[in-house]
């Protein structure tokens, strides 16, 4: 480590660790720069040589959160608890925990090689045709199509069952050894596994109570939205393949896990004459491309007061999938490079609808990072991580409401009326509440793995025991444990944790409420759109610009007025199709859930020789 | 804004027939379900039945066979027909919109 | 046919938290039951307050919830005010039709 890059001396009190914080935050900008510069490099160009690079990088990370972390220890271990200064607390508390930095050097360099070995093999896993040498399919974008707009069971199911084995069934060795590394890092921080740290930066002894409570509120709107959508599927698919009384075959649901299912919003939409809210093919016709759906999520922003994308960002970023056929990693991903000015996105973006509101998503991450880029590094987070998942979600449930899709332009006429808002609250459900049992589950199934109570003879049977549970649906082909089908979602291999977009899908409700009401809005709250409320601008700023230096309790409670996740607004923004769905349910003799749990399709006749291509 | 009002004939002899109306605003009767309620004197709620937003109807089947419900979607009215009235039929009936938009009710009194 | 219990009455005061519950003579009540809790007031006039289980209709205040405690449906009321003294209705679906309780007469000590 550079010696310039070492810690000093400073006084064992705490006017000491003010200096220490001071010296710790300009030496962890650089280090934090040439990681993420080297984490860029080899996500945008995945070579042996990146790789290579990119894990020498997080060595000198390693070093440098060791040597600055033993020293917290040293001189603040256990005084720092008692600091009068809140910020300084939250400082120390994050540079005294070592994470990977705890391993001997040989394993932090296996630690790197196996998160770098993971990344590699999700983002360049390919599924190619039976009996055709040549044709071969990335995940992005030519499986997502597939999944997308294919309505052939076989097709589904050969992209399905293709991606997750490439994906999944390599991963599973090293996943093991992720985890027994990992584990044993974070257990000299304290913690009793991987999953406990991670629970941890949401600050709460009751946070799985609290998250338990939350789903017990939404499960009723799912159960009724996953009725309603199976019913669908029957009446296009038939009795040989959709039970009514049974779970969902995964791979009819228009995306790869199911977790979201606006893309098949063709195939239930309630009321087919009205005007269509879907408006991709809308986009293609007015000739949007990438840079343009970045320009009008910008616009957005700035309407409200934010912060305008810098040219760093314009220059710097990867907003299409590369023609040159460099390997990259395409899922969309917003990166701070800690030195107050680089901010970039990568995103493989296609034109369509749902793009545009990930769009929207990721560029709610970077405008949080120019809000509180100015603080130490340590406080350079959102509030808690359903913070940071939540913002850009905010804006996207504005620029969704058809009556700004015809402010931008992609909806000829808005058409008021009851059909027309069921239409639109059905679309927005296929999104958000289809989403929420995946988000939950998907960290029940990995704090199991860390805690020892999934172990790897289980990692399959307990993800599909969660996803049958939870989601109410069925993998199309009989899996075993040779399957590791968690590897197939980008954010387990990826070592991404995944609660936070659970709580930020309930969490963007409470802040879309309150941000309505500021911008002076008293309709219903799904048709609010705080475009150009300066008022609502200000209130989110307030948010942003505090990062983590506030407990996220403190920071919800003076925007919303609570200081607690709360399922509430999320149910009054879907409650006409919350009333309609339950009508549709009750007329129709529908069963709610899957009493049938254990079903499982057949197999289409002649598969996979006679996929239709 | 959701409204509902019944309008019925107030008294009706025994043996004869009913017929109430409730007209709606501020939703479509092609969207939601409008169910009809009674409350006999001092007495709890009974559930009649429901016509759904596609047309469809179910019934309370103690009431079956006297009972029929219809509606107009574009005059937004939803039409309760009951026949054989006898004495216990008395009370207040009322439509409402899933259940949480009522009508104020009407009173119905089988006397001769 | 399926007989809705709930209890013929409760008494509470201000500020306190009350819950008033649903059984059904068939077993447990589920979401397939489509709990629903509606108030009529002294007035006779009949509001709904939770659609569904857990669903507050529009303008219902915060401190009413609806959820399923064990075997039953429950409508909690946090922070019991005067005004909620009334009377409380539940109503359970069964595959094709609807049955009220006989409903829960709420006395709020002002």
């Known amino acids: 480590l550079d010696p310039g890059l070492q810690p000093g001396n400073f006084s064992a009190d705490e006017a000491g660790a003010q200096l220490f914080a001071q010296s710790y935050n300009s030496s962890a900008e650089q280090v934090l720069f040439q990681s993420v510069a080297a984490s860029w490099a080899h996500d945008t160009n995945i070579t042996a040589e990146n790789a290579r690079r990119q894990e020498e990088a997080a060595l000198l990370s390693q070093e440098f959160a060791e040597a600055w972390g033993q020293k917290a220890k040293e001189l603040y271990e256990p005084i720092w608890q008692n600091f009068t200064d809140p910020q300084l607390r939250r400082i120390i508390g994050a540079v005294r925990t070592l994470g990977s930095a705890n391993l001997p050097l040989a394993k932090r360099q296996q630690y790197n090689a196996l998160l770098s070995n993971m990344s590699r093999i999700y983002s360049t896993a390919k599924v190619c045709l039976p009996n055709k040498t040549a044709t071969c399919w990335s995940l992005d974008p030519d499986l997502t199509n597939i999944l997308a707009s294919s309505r052939s069971y076989a097709m589904l199911l050969f992209a399905w069952e293709g991606w997750h084995n490439a994906a999944g069934i390599p991963l599973k060795p090293l996943y093991e050894d992720f985890t027994a590394l990992s584990n044993e890092a974070y257990k000299q921080d304290g913690f009793t596994d991987t999953g406990a740290y991670w629970r941890s930066w949401y600050n709460s002894p009751t946070f799985e109570d609290d998250l338990e409570h939350l789903y017990q509120q939404l499960e009723p709107l799912y159960l009724n939205l996953h009725a309603f959508v199976r019913r669908a599927l029957h009446r296009r698919y038939g009795d040989r393949y959709i039970n009514l009384r049974g779970p969902i075959p995964a791979h009819l649901l228009g995306d790869m896990w199911a977790q979201s299912w606006e893309n098949i919003y063709d195939m239930v939409v309630p009321f087919p004459d009205k005007p269509n809210l879907d408006v991709t093919s809308t986009m293609l016709q007015q000739g949007w491309n990438a840079t343009h759906m970045f320009r009008v999520a910008e616009e957005f922003f700035t309407s409200l007061e934010l912060s305008p994308m810098p040219p760093e960002f314009w220059e710097g970023s990867m907003l299409e999938k590369p023609a040159d056929g460099r390997e990259v990693v395409c899922h969309a991903s917003a990166w701070d490079f800690y030195n107050r000015k680089d901010f970039r996105i990568k995103q493989c973006t296609r034109v369509t609808m749902d793009q545009l509101s990930t769009v929207h998503h990721e560029m709610g991450h970077i405008q949080y990072y120019l809000q509180y880029k100015d603080l130490p590094v340590s406080l350079r987070r959102g509030a808690n991580p359903g913070f940071h998942e939540a913002i850009g979600d905010v804006l996207a449930l504005s620029v969704s409401t058809p009556e700004h899709l015809h402010k931008i332009g992609l909806l000829d006429r808005v058409t008021n009326d009851t059909e027309s808002d069921i239409n639109y609250l059905l679309k927005m459900a296929l999104e958000k509440i289809a989403f929420l049992p995946f988000g939950y589950l998907v960290d029940q199934w990995r704090w199991g793995v860390f805690s020892g109570r999934t172990p790897p003879s289980r990692y399959n049977f307990d993800w599909w025991y969660l996803r049958t549970k939870y989601q109410g649906i069925c993998p199309p082909v009989t899996r075993n444990e040779t399957h590791f089908d968690a590897g197939a979602k980008f954010h387990v291999p990826n070592v991404t944790p995944y609660i936070r977009y659970f709580v930020s899908f309930v969490l963007q409700f409470q802040f879309h409420e309150a941000l309505c009401k500021e911008a002076g809005y008293e309709g219903p709250l799904h048709q609010c759109d705080i475009y150009r409320s300066t008022k609502a601008g200000a209130k989110l700023r307030k948010v942003l610009q505090a990062g983590s230096s506030r407990p996220w309790q403190e920071v919800l409670k003076d925007m919303v007025g609570l200081d607690a996740l709360d399922a509430q607004p999320l149910l009054k923004y879907f409650q006409p199709v919350t009333q309609w769905l339950q009508e549709q349910n009750q007329q129709n003799g529908e069963v709610l859930g899957w009493p049938e749990y254990q079903w499982h399709p057949p197999l289409p006749d002649n598969y996979p020789e006679g996929i239709d291509l | 804004q959701v409204q509902l009002k019944e309008s019925g004939p107030g008294l009706v002899a025994p043996s004869q027939s009913l017929s109430i109306t409730c007209t709606v605003s501020?939703?479509?009767?092609?969207?939601?379900?409008v169910h009809w309620v009674r409350q006999p004197p001092g007495k709890g709620l009974e559930w009649l039945g429901v016509?759904?937003?596609?047309?469809?109807?179910n019934y309370n089947s103690a009431l079956m066979s006297r009972l029929n419900i219809t509606k107009d979607n574009s005059k937004r009215q939803v039409f309760l027909k009951m026949n054989s009235l006898q004495a216990d039929d008395t009370g207040m009936y009322y439509c409402?919109?899933?259940?949480?938009?009522w009508g104020q009710g009407t009173t119905l009194t089988v006397s001769s | 046919q399926a007989v809705v219990t709930q209890e013929s009455a409760l008494t509470t005061s201000p500020g306190e938290t009350v819950t008033l519950t649903c059984r059904s003579s068939?077993?447990?009540?589920?979401?397939?039951?489509?709990a629903n809790w509606v108030q009529e007031n002294p007035d006779h006039l009949f509001t709904g307050l939770i659609d569904?289980?857990?669903t507050r209709s529009p303008g219902v205040p915060a401190r009413f919830s609806g959820s399923l405690i064990g075997d039953k449906a429950a409508l909690t009321i946090t922070g019991a005010q005067t005004e909620d003294e009334a009377i409380y209705f539940c109503?359970?679906?069964?595959?094709?039709?609807?049955?009220f309780g006989g409903g829960t007469k709420l006395t709020v000590l002002g």
């Open positions: 109503a359970l679906w069964y595959s094709n039709h609807w049955v």
């Open positions: 068939t077993g447990a009540v589920t979401t397939n039951n489509y």
């Open positions: 409402a919109r899933g259940w949480d938009s």
């Open positions: 501020g939703f479509s009767l092609t969207t939601y379900g």
């Open positions: 016509i759904w937003g596609g047309g469809n109807t």
């Open positions: 569904g289980t857990n």
